[in-house]
């Protein structure tokens, strides 16, 4: 999987898209966890309604909410009130069973807030990066990672 | 083990710019917050500012805004910090440390540098 | 920014004696709170992070406490190489601020 970033702004809201294949997944229930370190387990932070008819409905968890269009195949998820501790690793996940699929990896990152007496010109912007430089970004908050650009790359 | 070992001491002209390096071994780079914190002689721990690699976005604090640049290279697994415009009261003692767990929610300073003494005197 | 007020400014204990310093926050900084430790000519060392973890090496005698605005370190029995400086620092919301520091010295 390749590992797609979404960028927010502290103490502002971020809505993640996880798009897939609706065919594929009917019927499964969507998940959203968070990656602990570089060979932790992925933690489980919220998950879509048990019945998987009311997946459209939104649920949160503290500053985290899930909902999941199953018939269009986007899982969102919004994370409120965003701050720096936010940032990390995570996965959309889709569960059957005890087992979960991975449907994208997603790296969270924080910028300060440009009006939180910062200049616009020290903040970053995607394609503005030396290491992001040929990364697809997908949309103003969204982009690609790089072959080779894993957050947690083996221990040296 | 993780070890930083920053640049040697260096002694500046008031007004002039100075840049301390911080390279990072035996362990991971691109995933851990790194923070630079001086401290003046007989003062407290005063952080100046951090940045995670892989992001390449630096944080700085309010007092330092515009007179500090913090960088990140990741294929060389060093950070620099680069310091403008100096004046005496910059004297100090300079660290890099780098979080014990992954990004801003570890960014508890687990691993520190041996220091770098910066002296401005005309 | 977040101010963190360290107190008592300076502790003098013998050794044997328990020790308990506070760290205070201007609003809530949750868990996201580190102690650290620092002797002369020497860099800071990581004691606790989120409160009350305490970090790998550490002794036993070394235990924090506390979330939200209130934080405490407490050192159970000093040992003469506990006398030193003692900083707390916040990494909720940058900037991440550090308490002025707590001295302890020998009676």
């Known amino acids: 999987h390749n590992t797609t970033v979404f960028q927010g702004v502290a103490g502002q809201s971020l809505q993640v898209s996880c798009p897939y294949d609706s065919m594929k997944h009917w019927g499964r229930r969507k998940a959203w966890c968070r990656q602990l370190g570089e060979k932790g387990p992925c933690q489980r932070v919220v998950s879509t309604h048990n019945l998987w008819l009311l997946s459209f409905l939104r649920r949160w968890n503290g500053s985290t909410a899930i909902t999941d269009d199953t018939l269009g195949g986007t899982l969102t998820i919004t994370l409120r009130n965003l701050q720096p501790h936010d940032a990390g690793l995570y996965q959309c996940q889709s569960l059957h069973g005890s087992e979960a699929d991975t449907l994208r990896k997603v790296l969270v990152e924080v910028l300060a807030d440009p009006l939180d007496h910062r200049d616009a010109g020290d903040l970053w912007f995607p394609g503005e990066s030396e290491s992001f430089e040929d990364a697809h970004v997908e949309h103003s908050i969204s982009r690609s990672l790089l072959e080779g650009e894993i957050p947690f790359p083996p221990t040296s | 083990q993780v070890q930083l070992v920053q640049s040697g001491a260096e002694v500046k002209k008031p007004g002039s710019s100075v840049k301390v390096s911080c390279k990072a071994s035996?362990?991971?780079?691109?995933?851990?917050?790194i923070s630079w914190v001086r401290q003046a002689p007989g003062q407290g721990l005063e952080w100046m500012g951090g940045i995670i690699p892989i992001f390449g976005t630096a944080n700085y604090a309010q007092k330092f805004q515009g007179r500090v640049t913090i960088t990140a290279d990741e294929s060389t697994s060093t950070a620099y910090m680069e310091l403008s415009s100096l004046r005496s009261e910059d004297t100090a003692v300079y660290y890099c440390?780098?979080?014990?767990?992954?990004?801003?929610?570890?960014?508890?300073?687990?691993?520190w540098g041996q220091g770098t003494l910066v002296t401005v005197s005309s | 920014e977040i101010v963190l007020t360290q107190s008592p400014a300076t502790l003098s204990l013998s050794p044997g004696e328990r020790a308990t310093l506070s760290c205070r926050a201007s609003q809530s900084v949750s868990s996201y709170l580190a102690w650290y430790q620092q002797k002369p000519g020497q860099a800071p060392r990581l004691l606790i992070y989120?409160?009350?973890n305490r970090a790998t090496g550490i002794p036993a005698r070394f235990s924090g406490s506390g979330s939200g605005t209130d934080f405490t370190l407490t050192i159970s029995s000093l040992e003469p190489e506990d006398f030193a400086v003692y900083y707390c620092?916040?990494?909720?919301?940058?900037?991440?601020?550090f308490g002025g520091g707590t001295k302890v010295e020998i009676k």
């Open positions: 035996g362990g991971t780079f691109s995933s851990y917050a």
């Open positions: 620092q916040q990494y909720v919301n940058w900037p991440f601020t």
């Open positions: 440390a780098r979080g014990g767990g992954t990004f801003w929610s570890g960014s508890w300073a687990l691993y």
């Open positions: 989120d409160a009350s």
